[in-house]
């Protein structure tokens, strides 16, 4: 006779935990409370991670790689909590952890699969190499291998060079795109599917501005609402390219609302900043101010680059003196 209400034999309850490199995580395990609790956490069914019985830890045979990195929630063991607090996870910690809990009346085994991800904030850089202009999306440390996509004027680009360097525990990735002579807008997206984290870099080229010497110029920089969230920490940097390298004119930190200005002729409008408008003025232009000006708005989730080309021409009177 087949039983009416039955439970099929489930060898182990399995959970997936996703951790971030160098951060602390909790491997969950619960049991029905009981007396004489024994808890053993093991890695890949062989390495001893943590042992507890007779009311205290017994770590004499703990694998050295877990030394000073594990602890239990001691005040909650009597309530059925056998979860493991795990400090500073590394990519080498990835794998299957088994928690054995025994009491005088019950025995359980829980399996926890730990996956570790890395996503150091990517950057979008604008570079000049000889006569060519490049946009480079790069991430210094990422795991697992990310998905990188480029768009030009919101249309996906199939061309996608990826320069990848693998280290022991993560990848370093550069994805350059040649944008020489283009006035289009570009977007690069880097997605870490494990951490469900996406970063977007957007580059916009503004029309060139022609100014006379001694005049002032206003350069606009307003974030695109799709990405920008004023509640999230971000940094705004204005810089000028001279002979292939950028020098910082000024920057603003949203966390402290600090503005640091390195160029005395540069001015920012505080009221506009409060409205998330980072347009700037550069006064008393001289011929050497000709060049490319870059506004970079960056957070953990995006980089918005706006580039202006400024041509400063001699004023009539200067020209007539010459």
């Amino acid at each position: 006779i087949f039983p009416l209400a039955f439970f099929i034999y489930v060898p182990m309850n399995e959970q997936i935990v996703i951790g971030r490199l160098d951060e602390d995580i909790i491997l969950p395990s619960s049991f029905e409370r009981g007396s004489e609790v024994v808890i053993h956490w093991k890695y890949q069914d062989s390495y001893k991670v943590h042992s507890y019985y007779k009311g205290s830890d017994h770590l004499e045979s703990q694998d050295p790689r877990y030394a000073n990195r594990t602890s239990l929630f001691y005040n909650e063991i009597q309530n059925g909590n056998a979860s493991l607090f795990f400090r500073r996870v590394s990519l080498l910690d990835e794998g299957i952890y088994t928690c054995y809990v025994g009491t005088a009346i019950q025995v359980i085994t829980n399996k926890v699969v730990l996956k570790v991800g890395v996503f150091l904030t990517p950057v979008m850089k604008y570079e000049k190499r000889n006569t060519n202009s490049f946009l480079i999306c790069s991430v210094l440390s990422v795991y697992p291998r990310p998905i990188i996509t480029w768009k030009m004027d919101n249309t996906p680009i199939s061309e996608n060079n990826m320069e990848e360097t693998g280290s022991l525990d993560s990848f370093s990735i550069n994805s350059p795109l040649n944008i020489t002579g283009s006035n289009s807008s570009y977007e690069c997206t880097i997605e870490n599917s494990l951490l469900k984290q996406t970063w977007t870099g957007r580059w916009t080229m503004k029309d060139g501005l022609h100014k006379m010497q001694s005049e002032h110029v206003s350069l606009s920089c307003q974030p695109v609402n799709d990405y920008f969230s004023p509640n999230q920490d971000f940094k705004v940097t204005w810089s000028r390219m001279k002979s292939g390298t950028f020098s910082v004119l000024a920057y603003y930190l949203s966390s402290s609302q600090n503005t640091i200005i390195n160029e005395s002729r540069f001015s920012w409008n505080k009221e506009l900043i409060n409205q998330s408008d980072f347009s700037m003025n550069l006064m008393d232009l001289n011929l050497s101010d000709s060049g490319e000006y870059l506004c970079n708005i960056s957070s953990d989730e995006y980089t918005l680059l706006t580039i202006h080309t400024v041509h400063v021409e001699p004023s009539q009177e200067t020209a007539s003196h010459n």
Epitope: V10, N13, V38, Y53, S61, T103, A104, V107
Partner: antibody, heavy 116, light 107 residues
């Protein structure tokens, strides 16, 4: 009084399956893990695995994975063990035993003979 | 898996004698050892757990001791009804494993 009453002896042919029952009384069935232990003739005891009546999950011995399936019927406070693809190696006495990591009450045992 | 070894398959003793049955674990099991008695034609009965804790109703002539890898079940004054097989079991970790058994015979 705690009691674990097992089903009677079984004579089965090689390749067949068999389901042994263990009916309990005298305690709250869902509070304890129910374990199963094999004792081959003239040999020692081998732990097969256990089942927690509340959630169906419990540890088991890898050696018996694919051989034994453990189930419970909470309404009748009965535990079951099904053994499949039987061979002469499976001929033994099988015990159900209540407990956590030690076994404080045992059934009387069910003798299984696998023979053609 | 942890291997439990009972080196003596048989032990012969007389009524009133003191007898010690030994069990060795292949690794430190931190006193997580139980002892069972199995009389002929019967199921095993729990005597001792956590190396030295006597189960309810077990006569006090049965005592357990040991630590690390070496464990002993001692019967201080053997009675005729103690004729049986004795098994040790480690309950330190799964899979739980038993010793091969020691048969106590009365001379």
């Amino acid at each position: 009084e705690v009691q674990l009453q097992q089903s009677g002896p079984e004579l089965v042919k090689p390749g067949a399956s068999v389901k042994i029952s263990c009916k309990t009384s005298g305690y709250t069935f869902t509070e304890y893990t129910m374990h199963w232990v094999k004792q081959s003739h003239g040999k020692s005891l081998e732990w097969i695995g256990g089942i927690n009546p509340n959630n169906g999950g419990a540890p088991y011995n890898q050696k018996f994975k694919g051989k034994a399936t453990l189930t419970v019927d909470k309404s009748s406070s009965t535990a079951y063990m099904e053994l499949r693809s039987l061979t002469s190696e499976d001929s033994a006495v099988y015990y159900c035993a209540r407990g956590g990591y030690y076994f404080d009450y045992w059934g009387q045992g069910t003798t299984l003979t696998v023979s053609s | 898996d942890i291997v439990m070894t009972q080196s003596h398959k048989f032990m012969s003793t007389s009524v009133g004698d003191r007898v010690s049955i030994t069990c060795k674990a292949s690794q430190d099991v931190s006193t997580a050892v139980a002892w069972y008695q199995q009389k002929s034609g019967q199921s095993p009965k729990l005597l001792i757990y956590w190396a030295s804790t006597r189960h309810t109703g077990v006569p006090d002539r049965f005592t357990g001791s040991g630590s690390g890898t070496d464990y002993t079940l001692t019967i201080s004054s053997v009675q005729a009804e103690d004729l049986a097989l004795y098994y040790c079991q480690q309950h330190y970790d799964t899979p739980f494993t038993f010793g091969g058994g020691t048969k106590l015979e009365i001379k």
